[in-house]
Amino acid sequence: SRGSCDSLCNCEEKDGTMLINCEAKGIKMVSEISVPPSRPFQLSLLNNGLTMLHTNDFSGLTNAISIHLGFNNIADIEIGAFNGLGLLKQLHINHNSLEILKEDTFHGLENLEFLQADNNFITVIEPSAFSKLNRLKVLILNDNAIESLPPNIFRFVPLTHLDLRGNQLQTLPYVGFLEHIGRILDLQLEDNKWACNCDLLQLKTWLENMPPQSIIGDVVCNSPPFFKGSILSRLKKESICPTPPVYEEHEDPSGSLHLAATSSINDSRMSTKTTSILKLPTKAPGLIPYITKPSTQLPGPYCPIPCNCKVLSPSGLLIHCQERNIESLSDLRPPPQNPRKLILAGNIIHSLMKSDLVEYFTLEMLHLGNNRIEVLEEGSFMNLTRLQKLYLNGNHLTKLSKGMFLGLHNLEYLYLEYNAIKEILPGTFNPMPKLKVLYLNNNLLQVLPPHIFSGVPLTKVNLKTNQFTHLPVSNILDDLDLLTQIDLEDNPWDCSCDLVGLQQWIQKLSKNTVTDDILCTSPGHLDKKELKALNSEILCPGLVNNPSMPTQTSYLMVTTPATTTNTADTILRSLTDAVPLS
């Protein structure tokens, strides 16, 4: 084979991963490539002569974690083309000649997290095309010719980013589509053929219920003629649909039905590390539409470069600095007057210093999600005494301490999901006496210190997808006396004596407080069994079932099996490296 590192392709190693560059080598068949066995690699076959992917084409490339097939002429993908790529996390097949995504097109890609298929000629997506992609978070389909999406196309797909710009879509129903994308953070819908009639009411209502931090592109009407060019969100429901049809209960477009899909705690809003990679050439994307068209554009001196600003009535500024390659808050000059909301998501901020936010004392919301923050100097938020919402999700934090959160007397919402947090020191949340909602999902937590929630009026806590094998009730969970929602799923729970207390605590909670089933990981015979359905005797043979039995309170480091994979860790590893932008 001529396609090895010492001949056709250029190879280099980076952080234990081989980067195999076979770009523009006139390769006509994947079989021309051979790669070093037994090590993870990223492969770029950008700009070659590939016209078809044949069954088992990639079967010898089992350690691939990223494959770039952009700018080829691939018009057909045979069933089983991706066999053997069970480790693949990213697939770029943009700028090819695909016209259809078939039921089995992506068979074998069960670990895929990122799929880029923009700028093809896709008209048809078959019903189960994505059904096996149970880890897919980012799907980029802009600039194709998709006229409709089959019902339930994303039923089993945990998408957070979906780009459908530049297609031929006329409507998106709630049932079968919107109901399945409740975790979405970034939904791009511009430049389609939207028919602004009664059928689109469900989409309008659903969009209105999206949280303010979600990024949603404008839906511009294409028909009927008198609405052509109008933005859906600015039209009154009555004008779109003068005589509302009768909906079945589960389709009621009033808005209430959407809450299940958009506000449950396990949706983990703004929680992935992928905002920055969406600077892909999806249309060669620029600024997010609603950011670039603020209702009141301020004159230069008041809005820091390189941001866009919007006046919030009665006073105060909304400052959008999303995805502007900002490395430090000191880059924002001149400092704004009376900032109310500051959105710095998707930048490249590495650290936050004490001096950075001194002038931002009027802030009520600060969004630092999806940056690269490793260092949070103690007292960085000291002046932010009015802050109510703080987003630190999708960063590189590893430890939380009390000093980090000093000054946040009015904070109610704290988003820390998708970091690499391994340790929370005692008293960390004490500076936030009004904290109601805490997202810690998708981190590396194994233990919590005693009394960590003491005196903190938390109503919603998300501890999903960490490394907990057990969690004491006494001095930890029993401090959560205002709790209305807790998410504990997707942890490597060890269903043994130490978990009896947790089981009993869960059983005492009202029905909807625990959002998802807690499944055992160990011991082996209880793997995937539901904790609440198990008899205490099974958990702890010989146990006298005494509700007052003490539960473990000691603050011990718990070792978990090395085989336990951590979603946050893998996402951080796979998605923070620069993604080829072509």
Epitope: E23, N47, N119, R165, G166, P281, K283, A284, L581, S582
Partner: antibody
Framework: QVQLVQSGAEVKKPGASVKVSCTAS????????LHWVRQAPGQGLEWVGI????????VYAQKFQGRVTMTRDTSTNTVYMELSSLRSEDTAVYYC?????????????WGQGTLVTVSA | EIVLTQSPATLSLSPGERATLSCRAS??????LAWYQQKPGQTPRLLIY???NRATGVPARFSGSGSGTDFTLTISSLETEDFAVYYC?????????FGGGTKVEIK
């Protein structure tokens, strides 16, 4: 209004290199791909390659691979096309052209062209 | 690469006449074919894309048809400003390729 302004005419000797610039204005630079297309005197149009101003590897026609380099400077909204090892048959007008927003492979605006003459 | 062959190379017609230009592809390009007009000393201008869609600002006398490998650009009634060279371009495959051009000249 959308404008693509190219650098002036160049006369080069065979074997030399030439670097042509194309400065964009009137639209958000990062939102649109830019292509380079050339036209030899009295001849048809020939696609050279494409670059995404917001980043990533440029893509070149196989014919020019190894001789052409496209780069970008987002601070000045400028893209560059450098062609090396020039030969007489590279004498042509070189155009930069913007890819349409919803049809990257179509050209909706063109620069005025830069005549590159390769002559001993 | 996909080769586009235009015919005739030159078309001599009078104003008011109908012009029919042909473009043939060496393999199917579906409907992804565009037509450009270039006047002497000027840059090309997009007229038709995806075989039959008129670009913004293009007069209704220009129309396109065809799919697969055979395409036609029709100018229903030639105006003096229509005398120019016309190129077809396919966008199905990389590299993007153009036809050799058809010159429409005044008879």
């Amino acid at each position: 209004q959308v404008q693509l302004v190219q650098s002036g005419a160049e006369v080069k000797k065979p074997g030399a290199s030439v670097k042509v610039s194309c400065t964009a204005s009137g639209y958000i630079f990062n939102d649109y791909y830019l292509h380079w297309v050339r036209q030899a005197p009295g001849q048809g149009l020939e696609w050279v390659g494409i670059i995404n101003p917001s980043g990533g590897s440029p893509v070149y026609a196989q014919k020019f691979q190894g001789r052409v380099t496209m780069t970008r400077d987002t601070s000045t909204n400028t893209v560059y096309m450098e062609l090396s090892s020039l030969r007489s048959e590279d004498t042509a007008v070189y155009y930069c052209a913007r890819g349409m927003v919803r049809g990257v492979r179509l050209f909706d605006y063109w620069g005025q062209g830069t005549l590159v003459t390769v002559s001993a | 690469e996909i080769v586009l062959t235009q015919s005739p190379a030159t078309l001599s017609l009078s104003p008011g006449e109908r012009a029919t230009l042909s473009c043939r592809a060496s393999q199917s390009v579906s409907s992804y074919l565009a037509w450009y007009q270039q006047k002497p000393g000027q840059t090309p201008r997009l007229l038709i894309y995806d075989a039959s869609n008129r670009a913004t600002g293009v007069p209704a006398r220009f129309s396109g048809s065809g799919s697969g490998t055979d395409f036609t650009l029709t100018i229903s009634s030639l105006e003096t400003e229509d005398f120019a060279v016309y190129y077809c371009q396919q966008r199905t495959n990389w590299p993007l390729t153009f036809g050799g051009g058809t010159k429409v000249e005044i008879k």
